[in-house]
C-alpha cells in the first residue's frame, strides 16, 4: 500500500506519457489520476514502466474498479496483466477474442526462445477459463488462438472440459498440440476427430486422424488396416493396448506396411509386448522378424471374457 502524499507542484499528470517513468512510486500515486489512467490505458504499454511502478498503477485501477475492470481497460492492460492475480481475473467478463489475444501476447514470456510454454501460468489459465465459460464452448477461433500460444493447451484440459470442444474445432488442432495428452483425453478427442474428418478420402483422412489414434477402438484400427495406410511405429506405440490386443498378425502387418520391421525393436515394450503374448507363435513366425513369446503351437486359447458373457 502506497501512503497518500500531496503531489509536488507542477508534477500533476495531464496525460499518460514517457515523463512518468521518472516518477517515484509515491509521485505516481499522488500525481496520476485513476480516471485519467483508465481512459488512457492504451498509452501505458507504450511506456516502459518498471515492475514496481506497475504496482502503483494497478492499485489505482483497483480503487477505481473494485468490482473488476471493464473490458475497455482489460484490452489495454499490456504488461499490467503480469501483475494480476487469478482472484483479480475472476472479477472480469472477457468476451472479445482480440482482448484474449492481446493479453496472451503480453504473457508470451518475452524471451527470444523458439519454445512456446506448454502450459499457461495460473492467471492465464484463469483468464482462458473465464473466456471459454463466457462463450459456452471451445469454438474453432478460440482453440486456434490458444493452441498457437500454448501448444499443450488441449492436453491441460480434463476429459470433461474436452467434451465441450465441438468437432468443427478439431480442424484447428496440430499434431504437436496432442503431444502431452494421455489416453483418457484422446478417448474424448478421437470420436470428435473421426466425425470432423469423415468426408476426407483414405490417405488424407489418415494424415489428419493419425495424431488422435491413441483414442481409437479396435474396429477402427481393423478398418484402417484395410486401407494401406503404413502407420509408423511411433503412432502404433501410442495406440490403446486394449485396442491393439485383438488385432491379428495379418491385420498388424497390413496396418504397419513396411514399418512392420520396427516391431522387433519394440518387442519388450507395450503395446507390442502384450500383443505378442496374445498371438500364435506360428503366426508371428510368418513375419520373419524373430519375434518370440507367442502362444506355442498346439495350445488352446480360451477367451474367458467371451465365456463370462455367455454365462
Amino acid at each position: 500500500e502506497v501512503e497518500k502524499t500531496a503531489c509536488p507542484s507542477g508534477k500533476k499528470a495531464r496525460e499518460i506519457d514517457e515523463s512518468l517513468i521518472f516518477y517515484k512510486k509515491w509521485e505516481l500515486e499522488a500525481c496520476v489520476d485513476a480516471a485519467l489512467l483508465a481512459t488512457q490505458m492504451d498509452r501505458v504499454n507504450a511506456i516502459p514502466f518498471t515492475y514496481e511502478q506497475l504496482d502503483v498503477l494497478k492499485h489505482k485501477l483497483d480503487e477505481l474498479y473494485p468490482q473488476g475492470y471493464p473490458e475497455s481497460v482489460i484490452q489495454h492492460l499490456g504488461y499490467l496483466f503480469l501483475k494480476m492475480s487469478p482472484e483479480d481475473i475472476r472479477k472480469w467478463n472477457v468476451t472479445s477474442l482480440e482482448t484474449l489475444k492481446a493479453l496472451l501476447e503480453v504473457n508470451k514470456g518475452h524471451e527470444m526462445s523458439p519454445q512456446a510454454p506448454r502450459r499457461p501460468l495460473p492467471q492465464v489459465a484463469t483468464l482462458i477459463d473465464r473466456f471459454v465459460k463466457g462463450r459456452g464452448q471451445l469454438d474453432k477461433d478460440t482453440l486456434d488462438t490458444l493452441t498457437a500460444f500454448y501448444p499443450g493447451y488441449l492436453c491441460s484440459l480434463s476429459p470433461e472440459e474436452l467434451s465441450s470442444v465441438p468437432p468443427s474445432s478439431i480442424w484447428a488442432v496440430r499434431p504437436q498440440d496432442l503431444d502431452t495428452c494421455d489416453p483418457r483425453q484422446l478417448d474424448v478427442l478421437y470420436p470428435k476427430a473421426r466425425l470432423a474428418f469423415q468426408n476426407m478420402n483414405g490417405s488424407e483422412y489418415f494424415v489428419k486422424i493419425q495424431s488422435f489414434l491413441g483414442g481409437a477402438p479396435t474396429e477402427d484400427l481393423k478398418a484402417l488396416s484395410q486401407q494401406n495406410v503404413s502407420m509408423d511405429l511411433a503412432t502404433f506405440m501410442k495406440l490403446r493396448t486394449d485396442a491393439v490386443l485383438p488385432l491379428t498378425v495379418a491385420e498388424v502387418q497390413k496396418l504397419l506396411g513396411p514399418h512392420v520391421e520396427g516391431l522387433k525393436a519394440e518387442e519388450r515394450h507395450r503395446p507390442v509386448r502384450d500383443w505378442i503374448l496374445r498371438q500364435r507363435q506360428d503366426d508371428l513366425d510368418t513375419l520373419g522378424l524373430g519375434l518370440q513369446g507367442g502362444i506355442p503351437n498346439g495350445y488352446l486359447v480360451l477367451d474367458l471374457s467371451m465365456q463370462e458373457a455367455l454365462s
Epitope: I21, F22, I47, P48, T50, L54, Y79
Partner: antibody
Framework: QVQLQQSGAELVKPGASLKLSCKAS????????MHWVRQAPGQGLEWIGA????????IYYQKFKSRFTITVDKSTSTAYMQLSSLTSEDTAVYYC?????????????WGQGTTVTVSS | DIVMTQSSSFMSASVGDRVSITCKAS??????LAWYQQKPGQSPKLLIY???TRQTGVPDRFSGSGSGTDFTLTISSVQSEDVATYFC?????????FGQGTKLEIK
Amino acid sequence: QVQLQQSGAELVKPGASLKLSCKASGYTFTSYWMHWVRQAPGQGLEWIGAIHPNSDNTIYYQKFKSRFTITVDKSTSTAYMQLSSLTSEDTAVYYCAIIITPVVPKFDYWGQGTTVTVSS
Amino acid sequence: DIVMTQSSSFMSASVGDRVSITCKASHDVGTSLAWYQQKPGQSPKLLIYWASTRQTGVPDRFSGSGSGTDFTLTISSVQSEDVATYFCQQYSSYPLTFGQGTKLEIK
C-alpha cells in the same frame, strides 16, 4: 541468434557532432526497446536513454536530453545515436543494448561497443 | 536518482576461493537488481537478475542474494576465467543506475 553490430571507433574534436549506429539482427527489431549505455575509461556504466523502434517513443536521462538524440531506421533494423557539442567528458565506449521485457529493464543483449575519443 | 555503491573497487582471490562482492542502493529497490560480468575488452554480460535468478547458461558457482538496499554476488569457487569487472544495476526505477564495478583478479 541476437546480434547488435556497432559502428567503428571515432576520434573527434571538442564541439563536434557524431552519429553512432547499431545494426540489429536475429530478432524482430520492432519488438524491443533499444537502449544506449556508456562507459568512460576506468569508470562504471551510465544509462543514456532508449527508443522503441515500433512507435519511435524515446526516453532520455535528463542530463543527456539536450545533446543526445536516439533514432531508428526500421527498414535496415538500425538504431542511431547522434551526439552533439562533444567535450572530453564524453570520451567513452558507447554500447547499444536491448531489453526483452520492458517492465524488467535488465540489459539482455549488448553490442560490442563503439569507442569515442574527444580530443583536440 | 538511486545511487548504487560497490564498496570494493578491487578484489584478489585464488582459484577455488569463495568470493563475495557487495552492492548497496541508496533507496529500497526490492529485488529489482541485476549483476553483470565484463571481461577485459568485452561488453558486459548479464549474470543474475531479480537479485538471485541466474541467467540461462551462467555456471551455478555464481549466485546472488539480498533485497531492499543490500545485495551480494557470490562466486562459490573462483575459476581463472572469472577474472572480470562485476557491476550491479538497479531497475526499480528510472534512470537505470549501475555500481562503479568491482574488479576481480586471480592471485
